[in-house]
């Protein structure tokens, strides 16, 4: 075996020392005679040592001994000892006691022979065995004074060879991770949890991660066990983006022909039933009413115009009932109602005129007289030397209950080419020109249009008391929605509990699956914030789709175009959710169409307003938006613009 050079020299030096042993002893006797018993000169000392280095080392110190103890002739024992020790440079021992094996006296010098693990001239320096090839250790080498030892990283143990390490399988201990899954790793182990959970080393269990604290959502965040959901301000026109964290605008995906005609007057703008136009005519010269206009509607009922004085004097109201013209009139306190002519709510333009003649009123449709009514008096009433006539369009200047026969005054209709009293009317034209809300869609079809900016609501009851007295009342919610959406997100139908500010039920369009966090176009049926069922829908194809929802004790179904949706809850969860719905239905609820009131975004899967055409049937009854308790003025009750034709 080959030894390193340093060790080799240490090994050889003692042998060398033994070769000089005899010579050294002889030299010691010679020194005794020449310089201890006698006083010696430098030359005599040179003869003893036979070399200059030792002589040069010895002689000055020899003179020091004389100075200290006197000359040899004084026979001071201290002198003899002093001189005898001078040539032995290992006395006193200059080498480090811990690290030295032996001290070798040399010519005016010494050599410290070190023990293994020590080095340096005096063997006082620890040799770092770890600095070369890690001391032969596989992992950790620990240097010690004069020695070293190997050890292993946490998770490993030292093999019997004292140098290599082997992995400890911590998972062999069933308590290593507690409730969590244990995975052994080289030198370690990991306690694993499902996504959305994090391991708690203190509790040795998986705990839900509150992702909401990490600020993942742009707007509202709701944490759930193992997951989270982000919500966007639907009422503000926002929905979740592709990343399911940020929000983006709800944009139309189907272009509707919403262009308006500046030369038209929309009669359905005021949901309150108040007139859209109020005109005051005043003349010095007695004048008769002449009114002519083109008219278009799909609405079966509502008021076209009123002409006359205050409600107790003389007036006429031209209205529509069951699609036919109706004339209500009051002359000097006596009221009458006449209805005649063809059904005119077919959605096509026709010319209607009202003419006050000497003793009768003539109503014409497309220049054909459909009513001729004898009257006693004039509509223009004299007052302080002037003749007065109030004319209102799309409503009456008093409450509809004060009519001869009550009528729903709201009329989703359109007028153009109007002419009042044979005069040019710049006032209305100018007003309409600058106010798009007073204008009609250029083209309309049957249906109701929800522009994505408002809702309507009704006060409907869903509880049914059976004929057998004493039995529990049952409940039922059956909704059929004929929809032609213009956007992929929005509430079609919902129930709202004002007292609890909760959304007991909602049916909506949504463009993602919230639990799978997957973008997909769906119809969702939900009780409060829990989705009961989902069904795919091709929402942006410009076609009409039929969404049917049926909920009653014990069952909930969702269908889109005749195909049943997939349940999102277990049978037990469904029963629990239906019980929640029933509890709500026993208290006052409002029925919402096209949107929700200002509720928290977490109240329902969707809070955005619906955009597109829709007609709703609830419990086998068609909902008429003119009959709603409230309707946003931009929702058109009986007309809907068509889908824009695709560009060639």
């Amino acid at each position: 075996a080959l030894l390193p050079a340093r060790e080799a020299t240490q090994f050889l030096r003692p042998r060398q020392r033994r070769a000089f042993q005899v010579f050294e002893e002889a030299k010691q006797g010679h020194l005794e005679r020449e310089c201890v018993e006698e006083l010696c000169s430098r030359e005599e000392a040179r003869e003893v040592f036979e070399n200059d280095p030792e002589t040069d080392y010895f002689y000055p110190r020899y003179l020091d001994c004389i100075n200290k103890y006197g000359s040899p002739y004084t026979k001071n024992s201290g002198f003899a000892t002093c001189v005898q020790n001078l040539p032995d440079q290992c006395t006193p021992n200059p080498c480090d006691r811990k690290g030295t094996q032996a001290c070798q006296d040399l010519m005016g010098n010494f050599f410290c022979l070190c023990k293994a693990g020590w080095g340096g001239r005096l063997c006082d320096k620890d040799v770092n065995e770890c600095s070369q090839e890690n001391g032969g250790c596989l992992q950790i080498c620990h240097n010690k004074p004069g020695s070293f030892h190997c050890s292993c990283h946490s998770g490993f143990e030292l093999s019997s060879d004292g140098r290599t390490c082997q992995d400890i399988d911590e998972c062999a201990d069933s308590e290593a991770c507690g409730e969590a899954r244990c995975k052994n790793l080289p030198g370690s182990y990991s306690c694993l949890c499902d996504e959305g959970f994090a391991y708690s080393s203190q509790e040795k269990a998986c705990r839900d991660v509150d992702e909401c604290l990490q600020g993942r959502c742009e707007q509202v965040c709701v944490n759930s066990p193992g997951s989270y959901t982000c919500h966007c301000d639907g009422r503000g026109g926002l929905k979740l983006s592709q990343d399911m964290d940020t929000c983006e605008d709800i944009l139309p995906c189907v272009p509707f022909s919403v262009a308006k005609s500046v030369k038209s007057l929309y009669l359905g703008r005021m949901f309150s039933g108040t007139p859209v136009i109020r005109l005051r005519f005043k003349r010095l010269q007695p004048t008769r009413l002449v009114a002519e206009f083109d008219f278009r509607t799909f609405d079966p009922e509502g008021i076209l115009l009123f002409a006359g004085g205050h409600q107790d004097s003389t007036w006429i109201v031209l209205a529509l009932r069951a699609g036919r013209l109706e004339l209500q009139l009051r002359y000097n306190g006596v009221g009458r109602v006449t209805s005649s002519g063809p059904v005119i709510n077919h959605g096509m333009w026709q010319t209607i005129s009202v003419e006050e003649l000497a003793r009768n009123l003539v109503i014409k449709v497309n220049r054909d007289a459909v009513m001729k009514i004898a009257v006693a008096g004039d509509l223009f009433q004299p007052e302080r030397g002037l003749y007065h006539l109030n004319l209102t369009v799309g409503g009456i200047p008093f409450h509809e209950k004060d009519l001869v026969q009550p009528i729903n005054p709201r009329l989703d209709g359109c007028m153009r080419s109007w002419n009042w009293l044979n005069g040019e009317d710049t006032t209305i034209q100018e007003t309409v020109k600058v106010n798009t809300r007073m204008q009609c869609f250029s083209v309309t079809e049957r249906g109701s249009f929800y522009p994505g900016s408002g809702f309507a609501f009704y006060s409907l009851d869903y509880m049914r008391t059976p004929l057998d007295v004493g039995t529990e009342s049952t409940w039922e919610v059956e909704v059929v929605a004929h929809i032609r959406p213009a956007a992929d997100t929005g509430v079609l139908f919902a129930l709202w509990a004002p007292d609890l500010r909760a959304v007991p039920l909602s049916v909506a369009l949504v463009d993602y699956h919230s639990t799978k966090k997957l973008k997909k176009q769906l119809v969702v049926l939900a009780v409060e914030h829990t989705a009961l069922a989902l069904m795919e829908i091709k929402v942006c194809d410009g076609q009409e789709h039929v969404v049917t929802v049926s909920l009653r004790d014990g069952e909930a179904t969702l269908e889109v175009d005749g195909t049943r949706g997939q349940s999102e809850v277990s049978a037990a969860q469904l029963q629990e959710r239906l019980a929640v719905l029933e509890r709500h239905l026993r208290s006052p609820v409002l029925t919402f169409a096209g949107g929700l009131p200002d509720v928290p975004v977490t109240s329902a899967p969707v809070t955005a307003f619906y955009r597109g055409c829709m007609t709703l049937e609830v419990n086998r009854r068609l909902l008429d938006l003119d009959e709603a308790a409230y309707k946003h003025s931009d929702i058109t009750a009986h007309s809907c613009p068509p889908v824009e034709p695709a560009a060639a």
Epitope: F281, K282, R283, L284, Q285, T287, R384, L386, N422
Partner: antibody, heavy 116, light 107 residues
């Protein structure tokens, strides 16, 4: 569109008569009455009265009863104002204006100067 | 006969100033008040008709308020073309009567 065009300025001597015209166009003449308004130099507006274009019946305010006459010729859709026995204080601009309870359409005005 | 008292008879203002003219009637005329602007050599122009209704094409800086016997006409920020005479006219009863007029001059 509605137009009311009046006859030109008149310079008359005191005691003379003057007849000024107001020609209407752009609407059915008999559907609206015709008003007459006076404005003396540097003064305000005064309503003189009106004429029923259906019947031809005039109505005058108290101040303008007597020497002032409103008349019509429906065949040429024209209304007239005649002032007899002119006085210096009759010097004014005379306007015709269509009846709408208030006055939207006006003639351009006719200046009548009475000076010896 | 309803008499109208219009004030002030004249006022000097700078461009951009607010102008307020009042008209007080001797009887209650509801809101049957009208306001006219007249420039030299021209017929009056109707700015506001009954019911404080701004006429088509009239700038929105012109407005009026009032009902009964007290009426106010306002120019929110006078423009160079607004220097003219202004009249109120009641159309509640015959005879129709005008106010004496207000001359709005450049300061």
């Amino acid at each position: 569109q509605v137009h009311l065009v009046q006859s030109g300025s008149e310079l008359k001597k005191p005691g003379a008569s003057v007849k000024i015209s107001c020609k209407a166009s752009g609407y059915t003449f008999t559907n609206y009455g015709m008003n007459w308004v006076r404005q003396a130099p540097g003064q305000g507006l005064e309503w003189m009265g009106w004429i029923n274009t259906n019947t031809g019946e005039p109505t005058y305010t108290e101040e303008f009863k007597g020497r002032f006459v409103f008349s019509l010729d429906t065949s040429v859709t024209t209304s007239y104002l005649q002032i007899s026995t002119l006085k210096a204080e009759d010097t004014a601009v005379y306007f015709c204006a269509r009846d709408e309870g208030w006055f939207v359409y006006w003639g351009q005005g006719t200046l009548v100067t009475v000076s010896s | 006969e309803t008499t109208l008292t219009q004030s002030p008879s004249s006022l000097s203002v700078s461009t951009g100033d607010r102008v307020t003219i009042t008209c007080i009637t001797s009887t209650d005329i509801d809101d049957d008040m009208n306001w006219y602007q007249q420039k030299p050599g021209k017929p009056p122009k109707l700015l506001i008709s009954e019911g404080n209704t701004l006429r088509p094409g009239v700038p929105s800086r012109f407005s009026s308020s009032g009902s009964g016997t007290d009426f106010t006409f306002t120019i929110s920020s006078t423009q160079p073309e607004d220097f003219a005479d202004y009249y109120c006219l009641q159309t509640d009863s015959v005879p129709l009567t005008f106010g004496q007029g207000t001359k709005v001059e450049i300061k």
